[in-house]
């Protein structure tokens, strides 16, 4: 659908007007944004700046090492997912500034807001892959010595990206632009119209595959890994624990509001007061989820500084140290290159 060429002011203060005063302009503007929208804009701005610069730096650092270091492959893919999502932010920012008016057309409506969901699925699937890698390093070190290679890592990443794209398709397909008559505004959103069951199904799948199942499996996975590491008195296990906890927590904390409001809205009538309240918080929940797209580089830097004691190195060299380290861990009387105790545990969360 082509974009609409008129600008649209906010007429929101007439939304609940029940009596008509012929001396009051019925189609004049009120330019104030709601508090949740203002907060969302602030978050979007910060995420864009930190996310684009931070992830670009991570991509730059890891791209050179990806041929030989498996860790670098994981971090490169995570950074690409985050970087891609950040590219949609200026458009989403502009839409909120214009009171959710969407002048960018139907194609942009389908693609751009779907990027954060692609990021969610890509990140969680990559994290699941990374977690499996770490699990194998701890519990199957011999197998890792024989089969763990860059080729297999790239295949695993490709599968993760493919599945992520598949899981994003429902959101992509149901996104439409709706041009509202009064106030004159073009909106970009999902429209299931006659099919409330399908809307609920999409929300439930998103909650289960993008949140609950990963939460369960990653918690179990890292519980086993950490128990084994502690029992073997592996070096730097407390540092590992701190980074893992930070990473897991960041993913699930920042996605929680989005997932909760999403599932609630799918079960509510669109005209109900609760639905309308949640809809007003929608942008804030999306922006909160978007923090995941800039948190990884921050965790890498903070963890890197922790490992160094203080920031003695340049940022790129610090990141290189963190993201491409393949440290040695004692396991079953053999030595294997492992990521278990690398500071790079960030791969945990989105």
């Amino acid at each position: 659908m082509d974009s609409f060429n008129y600008t649209t002011p906010d007429y929101g203060h007439y939304d609940d007007k029940d009596t008509l005063d012929l001396n009051t302009p019925v189609d004049k503007t009120s330019n104030t944004l709601r508090v949740p929208d203002i907060l969302a804009l602030v978050i979007f701005a910060v995420v864009f700046l930190v996310g684009v610069l931070g992830n670009a730096l991570v991509v730059w650092v890891t791209a050179f090492e990806a041929k030989r270091t498996i860790n670098a492959i994981w971090f490169l893919n995570l950074a690409v997912a985050d970087f891609l999502s950040c590219l949609a932010l200026p458009i989403l920012f502009t839409s909120i500034v214009q009171h959710h008016h969407w002048p960018f057309g139907g194609a942009a409506c389908s693609i751009l807001p779907s990027l954060i969901l692609l990021n969610m699925y890509a990140s969680i699937l990559l994290l699941a892959t990374i977690s499996a890698d770490r699990f194998l390093l701890v519990f199957k070190p011999i197998w890792c010595q024989n089969f763990r290679g860059a080729g297999l890592a790239w295949i695993a990443c490709a599968v993760a990206w493919g599945l992520a794209l598949l899981l994003t398709i429902p959101s992509f397909l149901y996104r439409v632009v709706r041009e509202e008559y009064f106030p004159p505004k073009v909106l970009c959103g999902v429209d299931y119209s006659h099919d409330k069951r399908r809307e609920r199904a999409v929300a439930i799948v998103r909650l289960v595959l993008g949140f609950l199942w990963p939460l369960l499996t990653l918690t179990i996975c890292y519980t086993f890994i950490l128990l084994r590491t502690w029992s073997r008195r592996a070096t730097r296990s407390t540092k590992t624990l701190k980074v893992v906890v930070a990473v897991v927590a960041s993913f699930f904390i920042f996605w929680l509001p989005y997932q909760v409001t999403g599932i609630m809205m799918s079960f509510l009538e669109p005209s109900s007061p609760t639905f309308l309240l949640l809809k007003k918080l929608d942008s804030l929940c999306v922006s909160f989820a978007y923090i995941n797209c800039c948190i990884n580089p921050i965790i890498y830097v903070v963890a890197g500084q922790g490992f160094q004691g203080r920031l003695r190195k340049s940022l790129p060299s610090l990141l290189r140290n963190v993201l491409t380290e393949e440290s040695v861990v004692r396991e079953s009387k053999s030595f294997t290159r492992s990521t278990v105790d690398t500071m790079a545990q960030k791969t945990q969360a989105v």
Partner: antibody, heavy 119, light 112 residues
């Protein structure tokens, strides 16, 4: 008392233009929108377009290239112009307004102008 | 465009009886502000349409209480509890949630 009164020609030749005037009273055009709707013989109603209080216009995309809506606030008049008329443009043309668009449908209507497109 | 489908096309009814007209939209008519801009009009022969019900169930000023509207999302109904002679004419449902506003095909209420 809100009123909308229409004036315009009854017969128009094919390929010619149609101009209809809607004069309103009881409210100000600077505050309220006015829409145009037509009804072909024996058929349903078709929305043509709207001009809002601030002068912003929106047209039915199917007819956009042939339609023009304008107004003169001081004279409380709204004008509809349809270009390149064909026989299937034969219809009763109405101006209408909700006044309060955040609540109502088209609450107030003009009396209608029957336009016949014929050679 | 939103397609408004009205049934039945013609509704023969005895005076004093109840009449019911159905209207279905091809898309949800819930506005982003939570309102549903579905309206009902009555057009008598040779007259302009007249607003009866606005926003699904609200009667416009001067409309008798025998007229009632209901529905949500995409399915709506207009009921006339006791049909009187002055109620005869063509009833249209219409939506003004989305551009362009669209009208149903009409239901002709006539004496059985």
């Amino acid at each position: 008392q809100v009123q909308l009164k229409q004036s315009g020609p009854g017969l128009v030749a094919p390929s010619q233009s149609l101009s209809i005037t809607c004069t309103v009273s009881g409210f100000s055009l600077t505050n309220c929108g006015v829409d145009w709707v037509r009804q072909s013989p024996g058929k349903s109603l078709e929305w043509l377009g709207v001009i809002w209080g601030d002068g912003l216009t929106k047209y039915n995309s199917a007819l956009k290239s042939r339609l023009s809506i304008s107004k003169d606030n001081s004279k409380s008049q709204v004008f509809l112009k349809v270009n390149s008329l064909q026989t299937d443009d034969t219809a009763v043309y109405y101006c209408a307004s909700a006044l309060d668009y955040s609540n109502y449908g088209f609450a107030y209507w003009g009396q209608g102008t029957l336009v016949t497109v014929s050679a | 465009d939103v397609v408004m489908t009205q049934t039945p096309l013609s509704l023969p009814v005895s005076l004093g009886n109840q009449a019911s007209i159905s209207c279905r939209s091809s898309q949800s008519l819930v506005h982003s502000n939570g309102n549903t801009y579905l309206h009902w009009y009555l057009q008598k022969p040779g007259q302009s349409p007249r607003l009866l019900i606005y926003k699904v169930f609200n009667r416009f000023s001067g409309v008798p209480d025998r007229f009632s509207g209901s529905g949500s999302g995409t399915d709506f109904t207009l009921k006339i509890s006791r049909v009187e002679a002055e109620d005869l004419g063509v009833y249209f449902c219409a939506q003004s949630t989305l551009v362009p506003p669209t009208f149903g095909g009409g239901t002709k209420l006539e004496i059985k």
